[in-house]
Amino acid sequence: FERTRSLQDPCSNCPAGTFCDNNRNQICSPCPPNSFSSAGGQRTCDICRQCKGVFRTRKECSSTSNAECDCTPGFHCLGAGCSMCEQDCKQGQELTKKGCKDCCFGTFNDQKRGICRPWTNCSLDGKSVLVNGTKERDVVCGPSPADLSPGASSVTPPAPAREPGHSPQ
């Protein structure tokens, strides 16, 4: 089948890094600068991605593979293949449409991206609080109160408001 196909379509012989040039009797021509073909048999080469502005080059474009971008310091990748760069916030903050905002009381964010999340309510999982939560850290749950030996104590956290009142995100 492959042999038959190549007789019918000379373009199928063109390897990655080349394209089948209709203007030159379907000869396999190398991809021009700043373009690539990652598979054989292509009739055109694709334009290389350019990592500009907040994007920086993680891998240079070659004749057979596209460039890969990541983000400059202070930003992180979002989307497939780092299609966007989003501003970092500090731990204990979340990125809203108005910029980085501190987590409200009763919520935390232990990363430079994402939202502020409510502290875990240990009692709902039948456990007690071992370590209080902060803006940067969730509470740490321990054994259930019944598992604690007499005289042992667990930290009682301040009760977070049911509606912590996130800044809009």
Epitope: C77, L78, E86, T96, K97, T107, Q111, R113, G114, I115, R117, P118, W119, T120, N121, L124, D125, D138, V139, C141, R162, E163, P164, G165, H166, P168, Q169
Partner: antibody, heavy 120, light 106 residues
Framework: QMQLVQSGAEVKKPGASVKVSCKAS????????MHWVRQAPGQGLEWMGW????????NYAQKFQGRVTITRDTSASTAYMELSSLRSEDTAVYYC?????????????WGQGTLVTVSS | SYELTQPPSVSVAPGKTARITCGGN??????VHWYQQKPGQAPVLVIY???DRPSGIPERFSGSNSGNTATLTISRVEAGDEADYYC?????????FGGGTQLTVL
């Protein structure tokens, strides 16, 4: 390619409990939150809660607090959702779903769903 | 608690543009995600952070969000787009879904 594979259909009596599992096969980076969402027959999607597989931290929808428990077994790359005191209104397809890398509640991968039927 | 309102159904002819709305108080200040669900299947994320598309989702799908309304727009509608569509936001410790919109391709 990461896939979420859930346990099979269950039939339960009112008042009983059900525990549904969700195994991540393929590459699943650490720290991706796992959510549980249910859908009653002919109805919309209803969020139940999440677990942070890295820490075990949870958050539950107010409606289910006291009846739902979400746990995980990191060594088996599996999350579990247990719902107790079942009633007929809990008949639904239960989905696990992975939150995406931006950690902004976008659910970018879903299990195939587990039908739980509650009937006397 | 926060509520999201979607029209129960939207009908559109093939090749035309479908617009599905999701209403909520000051929803423009929130990040909205959209899911497509075909009968008997799990939902699929089609738009996230208001207007971004996951890989594999056609460019025909786009989103916008301002004021009290977020909108999912599907241009050049195809028969295969017939499905239920749900919007979703995060509000004060809870994930909230809209009631869903059934898109019918005439």
């Amino acid at each position: 390619q990461m896939q979420l594979v859930q346990s099979g259909a269950e039939v339960k009596k009112p008042g009983a409990s059900v525990k549904v599992s969700c195994k991540a096969s393929g590459y699943m980076p650490d720290g991706y939150y796992m959510h549980w969402v249910r859908q009653a027959p002919g109805q919309g999607l209803e969020w139940m809660g999440w677990i942070n597989p890295r820490t075990g931290g949870t958050n539950y929808a107010q409606k289910f607090q006291g009846r739902v428990t979400i746990t995980r077994d990191t060594s088996a790359s599996t999350a579990y959702m247990e719902l107790s005191s079942l009633r007929s209104e809990d008949t639904a397809v239960y989905y696990c779903a992975r939150e995406g890398a931006a950690f902004r509640l976008e659910l970018d991968a879903w299990g195939q769903g587990t039908l739980v039927t509650v009937s006397s | 608690s926060y509520e999201l309102t979607q029209p129960p159904s939207v009908s559109v002819a093939p090749g035309k543009t479908a617009r599905i709305t999701c209403g909520g108080n000051n929803i423009g200040s929130k990040s909205v995600h959209w899911y497509q669900q075909k009968p008997g299947q799990a939902p699929v994320l089609v738009i996230y952070y208001d207007s971004d598309r996951p890989s594999g989702i056609p460019e025909r799908f786009s989103g916008s969000n301002s004021g009290n309304t977020a909108t999912l727009t599907i241009s050049r509608v195809e028969a295969g787009d017939e499905a239920d569509y749900y919007c979703q936001v995060w509000d004060s410790s809870s994930v909230v879904f809209g009631g869903g919109t059934q898109l019918t391709v005439l």
